[in-house]
């Protein structure tokens, strides 16, 4: 049985300065183009190499953009959201929601990012205990000789 996948949600304010080729990312979503089921929010679908967003480093593909320069992105048509970014000016403030994947459930059934799925301490503690028991047994054995 696989573990349940949960998400740790964090929010961040990201201030970008429009570069020579713009802000440097793509978006999906909107009321007419839901990217996530039952969610008409706006999501980052692509970050352009060497663009303003990539050079800043904080915005990630998959992030949900909540607002642009204080303007809420809820219940917007896709194209209206695109236009909002294009008309946002030179300095652009983004309120962003990051979703970090967290694994819950049985050990050994984790995602591709961790093939073994076993935390290091789960290996080290038994090994340390076994070593201690072996050392104690060896000492007892030597005393009996």
């Amino acid at each position: 049985m696989n573990g349940r996948v949960d998400y740790l949600v964090t929010e961040e304010e990201i201030n970008l300065t429009r570069g020579p080729s713009g802000l440097g990312f793509n978006i999906v979503g909107g009321t007419d183009q839901q990217y996530v089921s039952n969610d008409s929010g706006i999501y980052v679908s692509r970050i352009k190499e060497n663009g303003a967003a990539a050079l800043d480093g904080r915005l990630q593909e998959g992030d949900k953009i909540l607002s642009v320069n204080g303007q809420d992105l809820k219940n917007l048509l896709h194209q209206d959201a695109v236009d909002l970014f294009r008309n946002a000016g030179y300095a652009v403030s983004l309120r962003v929601q990051h979703r970090l994947q967290v694994q819950n459930g049985p050990i050994g059934h984790r995602g591709e990012g961790d093939p073994s799925g076993i935390p290091i301490f789960m290996v080290l503690v038994p090994v340390f205990a076994l070593t201690m028991v072996a050392a104690w047994a060896f000492m007892r054995y030597r005393q009996q000789l």
Partner: nanobody, 125 residues
Framework: DVQLVESGGGLVQAGGSLRLSCAAS????????MAWFRQGPGKEREFVAT????????YYADSVKGRFTISRDNAKNTVYLQMNSLKPEDTAVYYC???????????????????WGQGTQVTVS
Amino acid sequence: DVQLVESGGGLVQAGGSLRLSCAASGRAFDRYTMAWFRQGPGKEREFVATVGWNDNSIYYADSVKGRFTISRDNAKNTVYLQMNSLKPEDTAVYYCAATFGSPVDTPLDRGAYDFWGQGTQVTVS
């Protein structure tokens, strides 16, 4: 990711028409912004036309406005370029391009696109 294959190029007389097709393989084609670029002999690759996710957000280069029409069929994972009133200066290799989602910057720039086809030759005599 998406793979793009262009077809429909050929030799045509000035004033004639051609219809180029770009077949895309991959998931979520309807979420891609699609475009056509061209590269004439000894020239830089230049923007021709682009279409947004649901046949909206259409832009054309000034040199082709009124003569070329870009469209897409999301059910067939295909984008088209209908070229009418062709001129000798339209001679070029025509490339299909794609990017996932909508660029928040200009979609007319070559750098906005991540995926490219191999191109199809159009020669106007």
